[in-house]
């Protein structure tokens, strides 16, 4: 049903869903702090622009009685319950921030007449692609897929002279929310990744993964997995690995690789790590030592969501345009705004663009080094280290099929 929005006469409210089931187990207090920081900055920016208006946030909490798994598995109905709560209280703001779970976002988008914008820190799955009033501020699965296809096809770099067309994907069902949807996208038979590859097999058991490492009859030398180095070590341990195996470890929201004192463990030598360019993370700040890297990005996405709303509000107010219109709801895309740590770009479908970084372990220094970067906005790869000190023969990535190219 249509809910009146607290969104006019110089008073603009943001509805923030504080769901018990969330993409990351972040204390709600940290998200509140991030939202409040965003509000302070937005108020300052609007004031500097000569716009004398009030901007506030209403935090909508789930009762947690029914939907209490704490992760995204029971989030589908929780999101709708919160919307019902908003509806009953007649407390809808100009914009909805949250939810972060793919299940809940998809269902809320499906089951509501969305004449207001929805900003999500998460909603990584392909089912949340191309939604007209949804903005996602953490890299969705589609962006990862496009990088992988781009990288697989690349064959004109000094360190990668073969196009690849095959891959194994390790997916055992215990992944975090981001990894779950990233791997789900790679597994989906109708996805761009599957369409572009000639061979792709999903490994679901630890033993399957372990056997492939030395299997002479393997169909691909490349294995994609998602998680941190510790996750890989638990699975791989100190097992021998064939010299032409390449493990691609997707670990987007972990910037610990960029710390000065980090040394790559030996088991990472045949691994390429895909992560995001770190920017000014909250890393090393003693305030956030108790936060995992992903959670820092999660809180930052909430903060940037507030700043994005402030950016759009400022534009519409300066143009004398109404906020409670479909035009406003559809405007949160194809733009760049000033985020907390600098410019943030959204693509034509409201998804955040970023610089992905592919790292390798230098056999000389045992440090993680940048091999190449990838700009998701233009779908382009930029080599950084033209003479990498790889573990692989001739300092080149092997062919993806055993028996061809450097072994």
């Amino acid at each position: 049903s249509q809910v009146s929005q607290n969104c006019h006469n110089g008073s603009y409210e943001i509805s923030v869903l504080m769901m018990g089931n969330s993409a990351f187990a972040e204390p709600l207090k940290n998200l509140e702090d991030a939202v409040n920081e965003g509000l302070e900055i937005v108020r300052g920016r609007l004031q500097n622009a000569g716009l004398n208006v009030t901007v506030n946030a209403t935090f909508m909490y789930s009762d947690g009685l029914i939907h209490n798994s704490g992760d995204c598995r029971s989030s589908t109905c929780e999101g709708l319950d919160l919307l019902r709560k908003i509806s009953n209280a007649q407390r809808m703001g100009c914009v909805l921030i949250g939810p972060s779970c793919t299940y809940s976002t998809f269902q809320m988008y499906l089951d509501t007449e969305l004449s207001y914008p929805m900003i999500s820190a998460g909603s990584f799955g392909l089912s949340c692609d191309y939604k007209e009033t949804l903005t996602r501020l953490m890299s969705p699965a589609r962006k990862l897929m496009y990088f992988l296809v781009n990288f697989w096809k690349t064959n004109d770099l000094p360190f990668k002279t073969y196009s690849w067309s095959t891959s194994y994907v390790y997916k055992n069902g215990t992944e975090t929310e981001d990894c779950f949807w990233y791997l789900n996208a790679l597994e989906a038979s109708v996805s761009y990744f599957s369409h572009e590859l000639g061979f792709k097999v999903v490994l679901r058991q630890d033993k399957e993964f372990q056997d492939i490492l030395m299997d002479h009859n393997r169909k691909s030398n490349v294995i994609i997995m998602c998680g941190g180095p510790e996750f890989l070590y638990k699975l791989k341990g100190d097992r021998a690995v064939a010299e032409d195996i390449v493990i691609i470890l997707v670990d987007l929201f972990n910037d610990q690789y960029f710390e000065d004192n980090v040394t790559a463990p030996d088991y990472m030598k045949n691994v390429l790590v895909l992560t995001l360019s770190p920017g000014n993370s909250l890393l090393n700040s003693s305030f956030s030592r108790n936060l995992s890297p992903t959670k820092r990005d999660f809180a930052l996405a909430y903060l940037n969501g507030i700043l994005l709303f402030g950016h759009m509000l400022k534009i519409f107010l300066e143009n004398g345009e109404n906020i409670t219109t479909p035009k406003f709801a559809h405007a949160f895309r194809n733009l760049t705004f000033e985020g907390y740590d600098g410019p943030v770009t959204l693509d034509d479908w409201g998804d955040v663009d970023s610089t992905m970084v592919l790292l390798y372990t230098s056999v000389d220094t045992k440090k993680y080094k940048v091999l190449l970067t990838y700009d998701t906005h233009v779908n382009k790869t930029y080599p950084v280290d033209m003479s990498p000190t790889f573990t692989w023969k001739n300092s080149k990535l092997p062919n993806d099929i055993t028996g061809r190219g450097p072994q």
């Epitope: 702090d33 409040n36 302070e40 920016r45 090393n284 907390y340 600098g342």
Partner: nanobody
Amino acid sequence: QMQLVESGGGLVQAGGSLRLSCIASGLTFPTYAMGWFRQAPGKEREWVSCVTRSGGDTLYADSAKGRFTISRDNAKNTLFLQMNSLKPEDTAMYYCVAALFCHNLRLNTGNYWGQGTQVTVSS
């Protein structure tokens, strides 16, 4: 161990200017919001200004707006407060402060504090 060391305070006539500096050590400077508080004799500590960790946004108390400018140099781990058109009521001990967010800093929740530098404005 984190250390914030202020400098630049002193005695100045009303209408004059001062530039306060604060050098941070023992912390990753670009990951903190930085700001200034002040405390006049016999009064409570009062928030003056804050700058976000990238330096992209600055926030000011009403008493500082239009006269004070906060800035930071992340490469040199240094925070600045340029104070112009000083008034006798600006006389106070000025403290450099670090926090995760300006929001936390302003509310003084989990702040790191320097020892302060004295500013005296004579009429």
